[in-house]
């Protein structure tokens, strides 16, 4: 399956914080999504290939990494100035 | 086991076509994507591009833009290095390399050795 | 484009004798995720390149524990704690941390 951690997280004023996403499905794909109150998903970030990935339309204030294809951690970086969302990780084949 | 087979030595004359081929195995193919790497003789390692193996889209080092191409053929697990109009100073060693887990080039070809000469 | 430059060039020893090589980058290379893509690849005479060392520190799976990589930021250093006979050749610092990804010149270990 896919597993996407922590449940919940709370982030202090200037702190990065990252947010693990692991498959063992053997999808060579792997998106990261946020979804507002109210509002549809939109795409942060997506990785199709190891050490390789892609801004989707809401890059602004996170950063990636896709060193194994197994995981696509998402770090929210300080410089999110609204980070209070629903973020949902997924893949694909 | 993870290997990566190269075509074999060329020789070609100033503004001939050359392309070399890296088959892989071992591995799934579009799970990792391809360096290729040049060395003059004699000379050092020079990173000519990469090639995202699931999308087919390339990246180019500067000097490598306009006369290089890297493709792929999926069905065959095989990445290629077409140079164009060759000319002397491409003699050289390509060597395909995949970029593994962690960022590195944790498999290498055995190297192609290309001659340009009149 | 990140400048690598290695020292030194040629780095003459005793086998059993440790090896210190030095790679300094132009510019940071600590990506936006925080990590350090530099690498270090061993080319024994004839062979093709082999991955000794990524992400600054780590050991590739198969490279004894005489290698060891350390640094941040802009400078870097592989050692060779006892030099053995299929240790010789050249020694090159790659950063993939940033497009072009660009090797060091080269540090050719040989014996004294």
């Known amino acids: 399956g896919i597993t996407q951690s922590p449940k919940y997280l709370f982030r202090k004023e200037g702190q990065n914080v990252t947010l693990s996403c692991e498959q063992n499905l053997n999808h060579d794909a792997m998106y990261w999504y946020r979804q507002d109150p109210g509002q549809g998903l939109r795409l942060i970030y997506y990785s199709q290939i190891v050490n390789d990935f892609q801004k989707g339309d809401i890059a602004e204030g996170y950063s990636v990494s896709r060193e194994k294809k197994e995981s696509f951690p998402l770090t929210v970086t300080s410089a999110q100035k609204n980070p209070t969302a629903f973020y949902l990780c997924a893949s694909s084949i | 086991e993870v290997q990566l087979q190269e075509s074999g030595p060329d020789l070609k004359k100033p503004g001939e076509t050359v392309k070399i081929s890296c088959k892989a195995s071992?591995?799934?193919?579009?799970?990792?994507?391809m360096n290729w790497v040049k060395q003059a003789p004699g000379k050092g390692l020079k990173w000519m591009g990469y090639?995202?193996?699931?999308?087919?889209?390339?990246t180019y080092a500067d000097d490598f833009k306009g006369r290089f191409a890297f493709s792929l053929e999926t069905s065959a697990n095989t990445a290629y290095l077409q140079i164009n109009n060759l000319r002397n100073d491409d003699t050289a060693t390509y060597f395909c390399?995949?970029?593994?887990?962690?960022?590195?080039?944790?498999?290498w070809g055995q190297g192609t050795s290309v001659t340009v000469s009149s | 484009d990140i400048v690598m430059t290695q020292s030194p060039l040629s780095l003459p020893v005793s086998l059993g004798d440790q090896a210190s090589i030095s790679c300094r980058s132009s510019?940071?290379?600590?990506?936006?995720?925080?990590?350090?893509?530099l690498e270090w690849y061993l080319q024994k005479p004839g062979q093709s390149p082999e991955l000794l060392i990524y992400?600054?520190?780590n050991r590739f799976s198969g490279v004894p524990d005489r290698f060891s990589g350390s640094g941040s930021g802009t400078d870097f250093t592989l050692k060779i704690s006892r030099v053995e006979a299929e240790d010789l050749g050249v020694y090159y610092c790659?950063?993939?941390?940033?497009?072009?990804?660009?090797f060091g010149g080269g540090t050719k270990l040989e014996i004294k």
């Open positions: 390399a995949r970029w593994g887990n962690y960022g590195a080039m944790d498999y």
């Open positions: 071992g591995y799934t193919f579009t799970t990792y994507g």
């Open positions: 090639l995202n193996t699931y999308s087919g889209v390339s």
């Open positions: 510019q940071s290379i600590v990506r936006s995720n925080g990590f350090t893509y």
């Open positions: 992400k600054v520190s």
């Open positions: 790659f950063q993939s941390s940033h497009v072009p990804r660009t």
